[in-house]
């Protein structure tokens, strides 16, 4: 082209993919008449006529630009719509009169890439790898021109470093003409990189200037050998018998090594392997004092078969032994005295207290309980509680029953029982004493005796109500070596006037059941008249 060497640099027009490029023909009036212009695209130094302007009217030439060109600004500007990366080339306008002159425009096309997609090595990286290993990949899709990638570790850009850091990038051209950038970061990592944050950044240019997009941050699994092994016990703090105790082995390596937990045999002083669960945890449930002792953990690297031993750890399962009370089965005469002594062993200091079983009333704080001038009512249960105050819930108890010698003592002296004639009556009589009494009845019937506790007995009698029985009533007699005592049950016939609205209430001790002599399946309930219970 004549005079091309003297031509100024082309005017730069920058647009984003998909937008409209405005190509303004910069010929001055002296250089040419803008009502008569030819537009060319230049690709690989080949000019192609794409548009003609004649008398201010535009006409596209057949070809790739045919549908996308139009005139604007009274013919001085050519508008190119739907710009693609393939449009990045030189466009020139050529005026025909008074003499052939041309004006060149360099169209630059831009497209921001998509967010960079980072993928971390899912298998992890050993610290002892012989050469840099693949840490992560970064993909930036559909950018133009090719974006630049920068890799970061803990916020600092990574530079190529021989045998330490290697960044390998490549790009592919999509059918759209856009570029997809792929980059892989290879690095030799160290143990401290287990918490390192890696990300990639894409740097690209748009008409508005330079921009960048960052990927999310990732951490890479780093594998490093175990250097230290230790034991951890849960729960922390003082342990007691009955607790669920977990002993686990921990190591500072990744992946964790294979573990075994051993306990020192106190007699042989040899370490004996304990059975752990599938997670390698030794579970003591319930913990017993025999579990106390010295534990240690051994860790093996299965690849090298090198083993490491933890510091031994003393485990103390606190306990309270069975509580012993002396005398174990005390018997005393009324009016006498008694000293109860409580003993127990423990891994910690013990506190004792005595309680009355029936009322839970605290009688004494200390191992010795002294009772004086014993009454019959003093008979019954006394409980010694041995506890460790520093370990809540660690205690043992022992119950002792005190027996006071004495003749039988009746639950009631006399009682009225409402009955119907010909019914089978179920009568109860209760007595206590030491030695335990036996009960006899003054009428024939089916009697059965139940021992309620060492000093108390309950006898029940099934008897048919007859006129004679109504006349005499029923007596129960309790006897032991020290005497006898009697309770009387007066039988009274039920009639309609006797029954009151609440007459179906149960008496508690005596119930009467209908017999075949009366209506089948009917029941009648004895009614006891309210009266104070008598004793003795």
């Amino acid at each position: 082209v004549p005079g091309e060497a003297e031509q100024p640099a082309p005017e730069l027009v920058e647009v984003e993919v998909g937008s409209t490029a405005l190509l303004k023909c910069g010929l001055s009036q002296s250089q040419g008449n803008l009502s008569h212009v030819d537009w060319f695209s230049v690709h690989k130094e080949k000019r192609t006529l794409i548009f003609r302007v004649r008398q201010g009217q535009g006409q596209s030439e057949p070809g790739e630009y045919e549908q996308r060109l139009s005139l604007q600004d009274r013919g001085a500007t050519l508008a190119l719509t739907q710009v693609t990366p393939q449009d990045e080339r030189i466009f020139l306008c050529q005026g025909k009169r008074p003499r052939s002159q041309e004006y060149r425009i360099q169209l630059r096309v831009y497209k921001a890439p998509e967010e960079p997609n980072i993928q971390v090595n899912p298998l992890g990286i050993p610290v002892n790898s012989k050469e840099p290993e693949e840490v992560a990949t970064c993909v930036g899709r559909n950018g133009y021109p090719i974006p630049q990638v920068i890799w970061y570790k803990n916020g600092r850009p990574l530079k190529e470093e021989k045998n330490r850091v290697h960044i390998q990038s490549s790009q592919t051209v999509e059918s759209s003409g856009l570029y997809t950038l792929q980059s892989i970061l290879k690095a030799q990592l160290v143990k401290e990189d287990k918490d390192a944050q890696f990300y990639c950044e894409l740097n690209y240019r748009l008409p508005s200037g330079n921009h960048m997009k960052e990927s999310r941050e990732v951490t890479v699994p780093v594998f490093y050998p175990t250097e230290k092994v230790w034991l951890e016990v849960e729960p922390v703090g003082m342990l007691k018998e009955g607790d669920r105790v977990e002993i686990r082995c921990l190591a500072d390596g990744n992946p964790p090594p294979h573990f075994s937990i051993s306990k020192q045999n106190p007699s042989t002083r040899e370490a004996e392997e304990e059975t752990t669960n599938d997670n390698g945890v030794l579970v003591l449930e319930p913990a017993r004092k025999e579990h106390s002792g010295r534990y240690e953990c051994q860790a093996w690297n299965l690849d090298t078969m090198i083993s490491l031993l933890s510091e031994p750890q003393e485990l103390l399962v606190n306990y309270v032994s069975d509580v012993r009370v002396s005398p174990a089965a005390p018997e005393r005469q009324e009016g006498s005295s008694l000293t109860l002594t409580c003993e127990a062993e423990s891994s910690q200091d013990l506190e004792f207290q005595w309680l009355r079983e029936e009322t839970d009333q605290v009688l004494e704080r200390g191992p010795v309980l002294q009772l004086h001038d014993l009454k019959r009512e003093a008979g019954g249960g006394y409980r010694c509680v041995a506890s460790v105050p520093s370990i809540p819930g660690l205690n043992r108890t022992q119950l002792v029953k005190l027996a006071i010698f004495g003749p039988p003592w009746m639950a009631f002296k006399e009682r009225k029982v409402w009955v119907k004639e010909n019914m089978v009556l179920n009568l109860s009589c209760e007595a206590s004493g030491h030695p335990r009494p036996t009960i006899s009845w003054n009428v024939n019937g089916t009697a059965s005796e139940q021992d309620q506790d060492p000093q108390r007995v309950l006898s029940t009698l099934n008897v048919l109500v007859t006129p004679e029985l109504l006349e005499t009533g029923v007596e129960c007699t309790a006897s032991n070596d020290l005497g006898k005592n009697t309770s009387i049950l007066f039988l009274e016939l039920v009639n309609l006037t006797t029954l009151t609205p609440d007459s179906n209430t149960t008496t508690g001790l005596s119930t009467s059941t209908a017999s075949p002599h009366t209506r089948a399946n009917s029941t009648s309930t004895e009614r006891k008249l309210p009266e104070p219970e008598s004793r003795g």
Partner: antibody, heavy 118, light 106 residues
């Protein structure tokens, strides 16, 4: 073009050791990692082991103590050995190439069916 | 280990149908997921990687979506050659595959 081809015995006895070879072409073992994946008849795929382009070896922890993966870059071969074979190890064994810029498998061998039976 | 659960396990459809196959991860895997197609007696073939990127040479009727724990493979218009078993695979931590979805002709 990229190809991978598995070879090895079609039948092994219980307790024996299986040795499979994957011969690759169209790429270098120092530029792409290779994995072994197996598929019992009528069942799903299961990843077994991998060797990276840098030579680091990885194993599925379910089989770790029974597996060894190695490579001979000069022969373009990756070898998998699996000890103490059991009838439940009957499967089609595939070797697959890991895509250079990703972590998925872009090329697979045709697979070899290994039957474990006495 | 991360578990991958596919649904449904089998599916009947006709040529021209739009089909979706789901895959659920037991924990967040971001977009570290690939989809494979396997025909009887053949090796698996990758269709989608990074949850939504179409592998070179795979027809555009295949598409992938989702991130985190829930993912979908969609075939916009079934072709006769698409009847096969489809597997999802996570590569966020180790490699695990779903149990497969068998796509059959109705």
């Amino acid at each position: 073009q990229v190809t991978l081809k598995e070879s090895g015995p079609v039948l092994v006895k219980p307790t024996e050791t299986l040795t499979l070879t994957c011969t690759v072409s169209g790429f270098s073992l120092t530029s792409s990692g290779v994995s072994w994946v197996r598929q019992p008849p009528g069942k799903a795929l299961e990843w077994i082991a991998a060797i990276s382009s840098g030579g680091t070896t990885y194993y599925n922890s379910a089989f770790k103590s029974r597996l060894t993966i190695s490579r001979d870059t000069s022969k373009s071969q990756v070898v998998l050995t699996m000890t103490n074979m059991d009838p439940v190890d009957t499967a089609t064994y595939y070797c697959a190439r890991r895509y250079g810029y990703g972590w998925y498998f872009d090329f697979w061998g045709q697979g070899t069916l290994v039957t474990v039976s006495s | 280990d991360i578990q991958m659960t596919q649904s449904p396990s089998s599916l009947s459809a006709s040529v021209g149908d739009r089909v979706t196959i789901n895959c659920k991860a037991s924990q967040n895997i971001y977009n570290s997921l690939a989809w494979y197609q396997q025909k009887p007696g053949k090796a698996p073939k990758v269709l989608i990687f990074n949850a939504n990127s179409l592998q070179t040479g795979i027809p555009s009727r295949f598409s992938g979506s989702g991130s985190g724990t829930d993912f979908t493979l969609t075939i916009s218009s079934l072709q006769p050659e698409d009847f096969a078993t489809y597997y999802c695979q996570q590569f966020y931590s180790g490699y695990t595959f779903g149990q497969g979805t068998k796509l059959e002709i109705k």
